[in-house]
């Protein structure tokens, strides 16, 4: 009876997500058969989040809208380990929008999910950010410095990275 109600709950939760994500890849978390964490297929997972590399070229605003339609946001990078995971799936000759912008051109950078911007946990290329006109952040590869962030014009189309919390069922 307990197992039956748990299964019903899982199915209803899966139905919720089905409109955005017809297929989920789930793994058992820990030793308890009750706990499953899922990411949409073919998203990748790291710690408690799922990531999707969008290869369509769009402005920052459209990229964020594209992520939100999938129940996600443009990526918020909180640690070096998270960035190291993300870059494994990126192409060196491409740039990808992050969920980081300076809407007023005042050098007041902010994350899309309102995570406080912490100057100590940023990975800007040297000499970046450096332009009041460039109000959106990308991650890209520079041969001298490997992967890092750069500020660019928000309307210039780029690829992007979406991030969402894992789905627990």
């Amino acid at each position: 009876n307990f197992m039956y109600s748990k299964t019903v709950k899982r199915l209803s939760k899966l139905r919720e997500y089905q409109q955005y994500h017809p297929s989920l890849t789930c793994v058992m978390e820990g030793k308890d058969i009750e706990d499953w964490s899922c990411c949409p297929t073919p998203w990748t997972s790291f710690q408690s989040s799922c990531y999707f590399i969008s290869t369509g070229m769009q402005s920052w605003t459209k990229s964020q809208k594209n992520c939100s339609v999938m129940g996600a946001d443009l990526v918020v990078i909180n640690t070096r380990e998270e960035q190291d995971f993300i870059i494994q799936n990126l192409k060196r000759n491409s740039s990808y929008f992050l969920g980081l912008s300076d809407p007023g051109g005042r050098r007041h950078w902010q994350w899309v999910d309102q995570t406080p911007y912490n100057e100590n946990v940023t990975f800007w290329h040297s000499g970046e950010p450096n332009n009041l006109d460039e109000r959106c952040a990308i991650i890209n590869f520079r041969s001298s410095e490997e992967w890092g962030w750069n500020d660019i014009h928000c309307h210039v189309p780029q690829k992007s990275i979406c991030k969402m919390k894992k789905i627990y069922i």
Epitope: G104, G105, R106, R107, G127, N130, N131, L132, D133, H153, H155
Partner: antibody
């Protein structure tokens, strides 16, 4: 080549307003914000503020808030700065300057002298 | 606001000399320090940006250095056409601020 052409000298009465212009050419106007800088006679340069030629929003030096209004006309690639409630302290040369990488003003207009006199 | 203290306020040197102008910021400006030249006719030109990078078309006799709060502009092999007033400007924090200027005269 990049050029910023400013409007001519103005003589205006105290309490009046004046609007000076800065026309950009030789580059994509909306890719670069426009700064305005004041220089009173025999004094240093003073940053007034900056307007985004793409978004149209402005950042003003607190000192000039209420005194200055910056606007942009994308169709004519022209930035404007209006000075209101003029006093003799506003007598100065006003420069427009293009925003550049590394928080710099990379090209400057020739300056517009505004003289406030009754 | 960040205060920029420039010295000397005036300077007289001979053609061929090497001159140095200094600029001190009231707090760390992370190398966002730029130098401008204003000719006697009022024309303003960017010389050096981000402490040491030469702007397009600027002669190599101009150079910049520094870090933190202390910066300098050096003109080696002074030329007659270098008669001007020189200004430093910090771009690290709004509002952007300028030094008081250094008027350079040729002996």
């Amino acid at each position: 080549q990049v050029q910023l052409q400013q409007s001519g000298a103005e003589v205006v009465k105290p309490g009046a307003s004046v609007k000076i212009s800065c026309k950009g050419s030789g580059y994509t106007f909306t890719d670069y914000s426009m700064h305005w800088v004041k220089q009173a006679h025999a004094k240093s340069l003073e940053w007034i503020g900056v307007i985004s030629t793409y978004y149209g929003d402005s950042n003003y030096n607190q000192k000039f808030k209420g005194k200055v209004t910056m606007t942009v006309d994308k169709s004519s690639s022209t930035a404007y700065m209006e000075l209101s409630r003029l006093t003799s302290d506003d007598t100065a040369v006003y420069y427009c300057a293009r925003n550049g990488n590394f928080y710099v003003m990379d090209y400057w207009g020739q300056g517009t002298l505004v003289t406030v006199s009754s | 606001d960040i205060q920029m203290t420039q010295s000397p306020s005036s300077l007289s040197a001979s053609v061929g000399d090497r001159v140095t102008i200094t600029c001190q910021a009231s707090q760390d400006i992370s190398n966002y320090l730029n130098w401008y030249q204003q000719k006697p006719d009022g024309t303003v030109k960017l010389l050096i940006y981000y402490t040491s990078r030469l702007h397009t078309g600027v002669p190599s006799r101009f150079s910049g250095s520094g870090s933190g709060t202390d910066y300098s502009l050096t003109i080696s092999n002074l030329d007659q056409e270098d008669i001007a007033t020189y200004y430093c400007q910090q771009g690290n924090t709004l509002p952007w601020t300028f030094g008081g200027g250094t008027k350079l005269e040729i002996k």
